[in-house]
């Protein structure tokens, strides 16, 4: 019989003759994988295809962000008959193929995770040679990177009328809760979380008016841990300057 396949994702039309029912193109990826920053993650991806015993050249590709158009983070190519997929691209040298594409496995290991790796990834396989065909996962796998809090900046800045304010910025996932403590603040002061636009893992807390000299401590905490940092305010009394 004749099977005609329209691959809507690639806008290709393939017509093949088969003597028995064949596998269709499909990709199996989990919706989400979680891992901690600094650790490694595995992005599983397996596939089925209609080209039985395909032994020709193939390319395995992983993209980030969006399917079909997102930037490639990994690419390897296997020559006809070869089980070895030779890596041609590994962004920052952190992406490594675990699976064997000849055995329909494109699973990828991502090393030294950072919060910036928290995005969606899409696997793709391309056949060349006698058969020309390709397929890419539509929905991909979301890599959710978690991280204990880290205070990335703490500073004292001048504000109007010779006053001073303190800013503390921390990153983490889940986004950390920030608290200030210091002279005349009591034991601690909870700060309102304000994730910065376009920086989903960054949280900033402001202490608007530092009324006393001394040590001010910012504490960031989430379910994975806590971090703290301090600044010191010392004003030269009788002058308009300050030492921090």
């Amino acid at each position: 019989f004749v099977r005609t396949k329209i691959d809507t994702t690639e806008n290709l039309l393939n017509t093949e003759v088969h003597s028995s029912p064949a596998q269709r193109w499909s990709m199996q990826v989990p919706p989400e994988v979680s891992a901690e920053a600094g650790d490694a993650a595995v992005l599983p991806c397996t596939f089925t295809h209609p080209h039985r015993h395909y032994d020709g050249p193939l390319t395995a590709i992983w993209r980030a962000g969006e399917p079909y158009a997102g930037p490639q983070v990994f690419r390897c190519a296997a020559a006809r008959g070869s089980e070895l997929c030779q890596t041609a691209l590994s962004l920052h040298g952190r992406f490594r193929l675990l699976g064997n594409p000849r055995r329909n496995d494109l699973s990828l290991r991502v090393e030294r995770l950072a919060l910036a790796d928290d995005r969606r990834y899409f696997c793709r396989v391309e056949f060349a040679g006698d058969v020309h065909d390709r397929y890419e996962s539509r929905h991909g796998v979301r890599l959710h990177v978690t991280a204990a809090p880290r205070i990335v900046n703490i500073s004292v800045l001048p504000s109007p009328a010779h006053a001073f304010r303190a800013l503390c910025t921390a990153e983490g996932e889940p986004p950390p809760a920030l608290a200030w403590s210091g002279p005349a603040l009591g034991n601690s002061l909870a700060a309102v979380r304000s994730p910065r636009e376009g920086h989903g893992h960054l949280v900033t807390a402001e202490l608007p008016a530092l009324t006393h000299d001394g040590r001010y401590t910012c504490t960031a905490a989430n379910s994975l841990g806590r971090s703290e940092a301090s600044v010191y305010l010392f004003r030269f009394h009788g002058a308009s300057g300050a030492s921090t």
Epitope: A40, L43, Q86, T87, S107
Partner: antibody, heavy 121, light 111 residues
Framework: EVQVVESGGGLVQPGGSLRLSCATS????????MNWVRQAPGKGLEWVAQ??????????FYAESLEGRFTISRDNSKSTVYLQMNSLRAEDTAVYYC????????????WGQGTLVTVSS | DIVLTQSPDSLAVSLGERATINCRAS??????????IHWYQQKPGQPPKLLIY???NLASGIPARFSGSGSGTDFTLTISSLQAEDVATYYC?????????FGQGTKVEIK
């Protein structure tokens, strides 16, 4: 046929230096990571160092206790990997094996016969 | 560092009988279903040889009487029918986290 041949072992005094070489053939050297694994006499195996390939920026990794004293390097034109060992101690006495690993897996699919390093006064 | 503990330290098995070696990791070495444990065989005076990679995959040229299983922290190497040529020391190794570490080894002998 894959071949991995170590050389450069021998007797050295404590505090001395030695450079081990590992010549390979029978495979495309550029496609693989290379490692050194050692085995003290009558003891178990201990991974020493890894050097990755060009795609992986020739990144190097070391056992923490050895970092700073040992340096792994590779010469792709000669399909050879090296281990420079400085400030040698008695506890570095071992057979040193050169091993190959795939870019996707840190397991060692081919091993050389090893070269014996003896650190003694 | 991840510590691998093999048991038993030595094992005597009759020819044709099953030999089982265990390897326990101090923390999980499995990520998303992939287990980063590998097994090697070392005969006296020879370098080690890869038997099993990623817990259960038979290396090229290794007889089917060798098999591996396990997940998380507990792994097993099984020789289904011990042959005279299987007398050796067997090591597990993890590549979940650097530094890569080995178990202390299990010596297999004929009973």
């Amino acid at each position: 046929e894959v071949q991995v041949v170590e050389s450069g072992g021998g007797l050295v005094q404590p505090g001395g230096s030695l450079r081990l070489s590992c010549a390979t053939s029978g495979f495309n050297f550029n496609d693989y990571f290379m490692n050194w694994v050692r085995q003290a006499p009558g003891k178990g195996l201990e991974w020493v160092a890894q050097i990755r390939n060009k795609i992986y920026t020739y990144a190097t990794f070391y056992a923490e206790s050895l970092e700073g004293r040992f340096t792994i390097s590779r010469d792709n034109s000669k399909s050879t990997v090296y281990l420079q060992m400085n400030s040698l101690r008695a506890e570095d006495t071992a057979v040193y094996y050169c091993t190959r690993s795939l870019t996707g897996g840190d397991y060692f699919d081919y091993w050389g016969q090893g070269t014996l390093v003896t650190v003694s006064s | 560092d991840i510590v691998l503990t093999q048991s038993p330290d030595s094992l005597a098995v009759s020819l044709g009988e099953r030999a089982t070696i265990n390897c326990r990791a101090s923390q999980s070495v499995t990520i998303s279903g992939y287990s980063f444990i590998h097994w090697y065989q070392q005969k006296p005076g020879q370098p080690p040889k890869l038997l099993i990679y990623r817990a259960s995959n038979l290396a090229s040229g290794i007889p089917a009487r060798f098999s591996g299983s396990g997940s998380g922290t507990d792994f097993t190497l099984t020789i289904s029918s011990l042959q005279a040529e299987d007398v050796a020391t067997y090591y597990c190794q993890q590549s979940r986290k650097s530094p890569w570490t080995f178990g202390q080894g299990t010596k297999v002998e004929i009973k």
